[in-house]
């Protein structure tokens, strides 16, 4: 992982939506029952920051431990600290709780950086500000870690919402979300809203504040303006989606649509950034310094290393342009998109000059693995992962953070034809091998 | 080869503006790949940055001295410039122009500087 | 704000001897970092940037290291030349306007 990307190795303030809400459209969706509506107990239940994570309260065991667990859409394990660390301020203690199974047997993961192991077993689990279930789930104790627990945090596990595919130690682990639907009547569904505060916010804030919502088994209708868009999750591993179309302040990249993809474009709440595949980043960065050419910035702003400030209220965001990717539709043909803005992709960064300053961190970077659409890319849109129906919706968030001039979209439908060209076919040999990673 | 040369008169009257210009040679200032910037340096003290310019003519200033200075760029005689307005004693120094680059970062090419005394 | 600070103030050397100047920063400024060597009456020259790349024309005598918040200016063998005041400046919060206190290299 470079400079703390991925989540956990990878590298809002208030009670009311960050950033200005925008007017509601009305056509919206036919109504789904039980899975569309308000889920008031599990709004606002996020709290954190792109930059660490966005985490949920969770308990475990009998009695119930209290812990704050990442939400990570790009790991199938649910993995908690289980024994002291410097960076934790508690940890699941298995023998304190009477309902904790031993499975008897070990897994390891490790990171292009770092690495986390421990032993599974099973304990009862439930959320807090979530559906009124407990479930009984696998659990990896994590006895021992590096580079993983991020000092700060305030979290002390991660719940990998992926799919068994890429479980550890292998696809027979089944992964949380999976025993969720299975013991109770939970429909297979979730989303996320999560809010970027738009500006940097200090350790106590990040407790006080609120981080976003996960609605576990629906939509709920207050997270989001306008209407649900929604492209095919092309296999179900990663939450794995097909990119058609690149814009740059609608400047066509004008690349082969097989770069978007290569080896993959997933969907990644544990990872900060947009990640893009190395031919794609270099074609994206020299459109963005093109298009904000009456400044200059560093170089090692662009490999999203030195942070660029300015005074307090003048970052200059009309000078960078909106940045659009191009979705796979459900329709033959159909693409839609969805457009972020500077306030998602510059990331506020605290700590390092006077009060007096606005500071950022450039957050697209060069990815080797394909392209991952981190906490910037979800941060401007509630994001719906609609499992039974094995696809992903996009909505503007209520939350995103903008100005008076520009806001997030998602727009559609477009024509797109031969989308399925668009999709990278990984090598057999390359899955066996397959990199935890998120570098 | 490229060199950077200060101008500018040597002695300024307090709540007056100070005005310096740097020229530079062997090379155009419309080279994309250059701040310009000016750093001054108090007698028997250390350096401290005010400000920089793209030629463009986008500044950047240092926050303690923003609301005096101003830095402009005149590409056509590949010239640079700086005003300080309603200056003191304590703005008495050598004024150093400089090329900033590797990467737009670090100070890579400095003129000679000259002393701006402040005094009625 | 990202303070440097430099030390020791004045280090007294013979020439020959080596030379080894500490800047310390407040908080990571990874490897964004430069030095510069100011003689008397003149302008400062830049040495090394991003903490240990030496700048050109410079020679192989003068060698930064360090990264996060720990630097080290190394001059290996002092030549008479040398004795001057070297400075630290940060660029890893951009624009670069942070310098150190400086460190007077003298004729023991």
């Known amino acids: 992982t470079q400079h703390g990307i991925r989540l956990p190795l990878r590298s809002g303030l208030g009670g009311a939506p960050l950033g200005l809400r925008l007017p509601r459209e009305t056509d919206e969706e036919p109504e789904e029952p039980g899975r569309r509506g308000s889920f008031v107990e599990m709004v606002d239940n996020l709290r954190g920051k792109s930059g660490q994570g966005y985490y949920v309260e969770m308990t475990v065991g009998s009695p119930p431990q209290t812990l704050n667990i990442l939400v990570d859409t790009g790991s199938s394990n649910f993995a908690v600290g289980a024994a002291p660390h410097p960076f934790l301020h508690r940890y699941y203690q298995r023998q304190l709780s009477s309902t904790y199974r031993d499975l008897r047997k070990g897994v390891y993961v490790p990171y292009t950086q770092g690495k986390w192991e421990g032993e599974l077993g099973t304990d009862l689990v439930s959320i807090p500000h979530g559906p009124n279930v407990t479930v009984r789930a696998n659990i990896a104790a994590i006895t021992e870690s590096d580079k993983f627990f991020i000092n700060g945090s305030n979290w002390e596990g991660i719940l990998g919402l992926a799919y068994a595919e890429i479980a550890r130690p292998d696809d027979s682990l089944e992964p949380f979300f999976d025993s969720l639907v299975k013991q109770t009547h939970v429909p297979n569904l979730f989303s996320l809203q999560l809010c970027g505060a738009g500006f940097p916010l200090n350790q106590s804030e990040v407790l006080a504040s609120v981080g976003g919502s996960m609605i576990i088994g629906g939509i709920d209708h207050s997270l989001y303006t306008g209407s649900l868009w929604y492209t095919p999750i092309r296999r179900e591993w990663y939450y794995e989606v097909i990119i058609v179309r690149v814009e740059i302040n609608g400047q066509d990249l004008k690349m082969d649509c097989k770069e978007y993809n290569y080896d993959k474009s997933i969907v990644d709440s544990g990872t900060t950034n947009l990640r893009l595949p190395k031919k794609v980043f270099e074609a994206a960065v020299k459109s963005i310094k093109a298009a904000s050419s009456t400044e200059k910035f560093p170089d090692g702003f662009w490999l999203g290393e030195q942070l660029v400030c300015w005074q307090a209220g003048t970052t200059p965001w009309n000078i960078f342009p909106v940045i659009s990717l191009y979705l796979m539709g459900e329709v033959t043909n159909q693409s839609f998109r969805i457009t972020i803005l500077p306030q998602q992709y510059l990331r506020p960064v605290e700590d390092v000059a006077t009060s007096q300053d606005d500071c950022y961190k450039f957050a697209i970077s060069q990815s080797s693995t394909g392209t991952v659409m981190g906490a910037v890319i979800m941060e401007g849109f509630y994001v719906v992962f609609d499992r039974a129906r094995k696809r992903i919706g996009f909505a503007v968030s209520a939350c995103h953070v903008h100005d008076e001039f520009r806001t997030a979209a998602v727009e559609g439908p477009f024509v797109t034809l031969d989308m399925e060209d668009c999709g990278y076919n990984i090598p057999q040999t390359d899955e066996s091998t397959l990199m935890t990673g998120r570098a | 080869q490229l060199q950077l040369q200060e101008s500018g008169p040597g002695l300024v009257k307090p709540s007056e503006t100070l005005s310096l210009t740097c020229t530079v040679s062997g090379g155009s200032i419309s080279r994309g790949s250059y701040y310009w910037g000016w750093i001054r340096q108090p007698p028997g003290k250390g350096l401290e940055w005010i400000g920089m310019?793209?030629?463009?003519?986008?500044?950047w200033y240092n926050p303690s001295l923003k609301s005096r200075v101003t830095i402009s760029v005149d590409t056509s005689k590949n010239q640079f410039s700086l005003k300080l307005s309603s200056v003191t004693a304590a703005d008495t120094a050598v004024y150093y122009c400089?090329?900033?680059?590797?990467?737009?970062?670090?100070?890579?090419?400095w003129g000679r500087g000259t002393l701006v005394t402040v005094s009625s | 704000e990202i303070v440097l600070t430099q030390s020791p103030a004045t280090l007294s050397l013979s020439p020959g001897e080596r030379a080894t100047l500490s800047c310390r920063a407040s908080q990571s400024v990874s490897s964004y970092l430069a030095w510069y060597q100011q003689k008397p009456g003149q302008a400062p020259r830049l040495l090394i940037y991003?903490?240990?790349n030496r700048a050109t024309g410079i020679p192989a005598r003068f060698s930064g290291s360090g990264s996060g918040t720990d630097f080290t200016l190394t001059i290996s063998s002092l030549e008479p030349e040398d004795f001057a005041v070297y400075y630290c400046q940060q660029a890893y919060v951009w624009p670069p306007r942070t310098f150190g206190g400086g460190t007077k290299v003298e004729i023991k």
């Open positions: 400089a090329r900033v680059g590797h990467g737009v970062s670090y100070f890579d090419l």
């Open positions: 991003d903490a240990s």
């Open positions: 310019i793209y030629y463009s003519g986008s500044t």
